[in-house]
């Protein structure tokens, strides 16, 4: 008998998954930028806003060159999971002032979830250790006021923007190493 029949190729491979993750990250970055601009138009920010529960920015321009695939993917997933929870919290507890942005926040959440699934698939295909997608987190309390929820939204969108910006650069760099 001849060699056994091979398997047909599935829809994607790790390199295609990485390409897909880059495209999803870029489009999420554009969405975030647009939503942040809408926020600034509707609710002008008085300076920079921060939120203690948000992850600290993982990378700087100086550290990009030393990135390793497992570290980048793990950190990116953990950070994006945190932002996903914050977006869910905004939609749930943001109050009437943010209700006008509900369609955009809903779309942002859906895209974030899609990117996280793609990253999980990539890590499975590479057989890299994976942090649990639904790790227990510090519960987010309701914003102290309407202005508190607006400040939180500015902080969340600003932080997500910076995270996605380094993510695009990091993922593009990793493409050359896979």
């Amino acid at each position: 008998p001849g060699p056994p029949a091979g398997s047909p190729r599935v829809s994607s491979d790790p390199r295609a998954d990485l390409d897909s993750a880059v495209l999803l990250t870029r489009s999420l970055l554009a969405d975030t930028r647009q939503l942040a601009a809408q926020m600034r138009d509707k609710f002008p920010a008085d300076g920079d806003h921060s939120l203690d529960s948000l992850p600290t920015l993982a990378m700087s321009a100086g550290t990009l060159g030393s990135l390793q695939l497992p570290g980048v993917l793990t950190r990116l997933r953990v950070d994006l999971m945190s932002y996903l929870r914050h977006v869910q919290w905004l939609r749930r507890a943001g109050g009437p002032s943010l209700k006008t942005l509900e369609p955009e926040l809903g779309a942002l959440q859906a895209r974030l979830e899609r990117l996280l699934r793609r990253l999980q698939l990539l890590m499975s295909r590479l057989a890299l250790p994976q942090a649990a997608p639904d790790q227990p987190v510090i519960p987010l309390g309701p914003p102290a006021s309407a202005w508190g929820s607006i400040r939180a939204a500015h902080a969340i969108l600003g932080g997500l923007h910076l995270t996605l910006d380094w993510a695009v650069r990091g993922l593009l760099l990793l493409k050359t190493r896979l």
Epitope: R15, A127, L128
Partner: antibody, heavy 114, light 111 residues
Framework: EVQLLESGGGLVQPGGSLRLSCAAS????????MHWVRQAPGKGLEWVSV????????YYADSVKGRFTISRDNSKNTLYLQMNSLRAEDTAVYYC???????WGQGTLVTVSS | QSVLTQPPSASGTPGQRVTISCTGS?????????VHWYQQLPGTAPKLLIY???ERPSGVPDRFSGSKSGTSASLAISGLRSEDEADYYC???????????FGGGTKLTVL
């Protein structure tokens, strides 16, 4: 077309050793994590071990920990499983699989019996 | 004892819709890891049928679909055909093992 071809199976006595190999072709082997999964006669699938795309991470099922060693040679597109201190309950068809696993070989039968 | 729980058997007549369930725990499906489904025809190696909960590899008919909710997942097969008679396995990554875990398998009989 993706092909995974296992070899090295056979009859071995309890306490003995075997080395399984899996030759891969038709895809970028070095971009995929690789698994060994086994299936005892008439039973379900049991994951045995996994090695990351570059060999830097290796994990094992509790049932084989300390006895089996997974390795890979990306220059030869080949995956290995060194099996020591074999027991009767290790008798199974051993499949090599790539990715999620996305692709599976046809399997090689390992029989541990005196 | 398998880590993921599936019914040992399921059956249906040609043209019918059947579903196969898969229940996990807080370290695999319940932790948010994606679920994958495999079909194993008699005497052959398993074949990927559904990945990432509901995505189909190329060549898999759209009669096969997957879904996931909480700690469980299910595979649905509509327009059942005689060639669908096989063993079906679910799998998910398990964070405590750092590897995939499988269900015990469901033998599907087309009556």
């Amino acid at each position: 077309e993706v092909q995974l071809l296992e070899s090295g199976g056979g009859l071995v006595q309890p306490g003995g050793s075997l080395r399984l190999s899996c030759a891969a072709s038709g895809f970028t082997f070095s971009s995929y994590g690789m698994h060994w999964v086994r299936q005892a006669p008439g039973k379900g699938l049991e994951w045995v071990s996994v090695i990351s795309y570059d060999g830097s991470y290796k994990y094992y099922a509790d049932s084989v920990k300390g006895r089996f060693t997974i390795s890979r040679d990306n220059s030869k597109n080949t995956l290995y499983l060194q099996m020591n201190s074999l027991r009767a309950e290790d008798t199974a068809v051993y499949y090599c699989a790539a990715g999620v696993p996305d692709y599976w070989g046809q399997g090689t039968l390992v029989t541990v019996s005196s | 004892q398998s880590v993921l729980t599936q019914p040992p058997s399921a059956s249906g007549t040609p043209g019918q819709r059947v579903t196969i369930s898969c229940t996990g725990s807080s370290s695999n499906i319940g932790a948010g890891y994606d679920v994958h489904w495999y079909q194993q025809l008699p005497g052959t190696a398993p074949k990927l049928l559904i990945y990432s909960n509901n995505e189909r590899p190329s060549g898999v008919p759209d009669r096969f679909s997957g879904s996931k909710s909480g700690t469980s997942a299910s595979l649905a097969i509509s327009g059942l055909r005689s060639e669908d008679e096989a063993d079906y396995y679910c799998a998910a990554w398990d964070g405590s093992l750092n590897g995939p875990v499988f269900g015990g398998g469901t033998k599907l009989t087309v009556l």
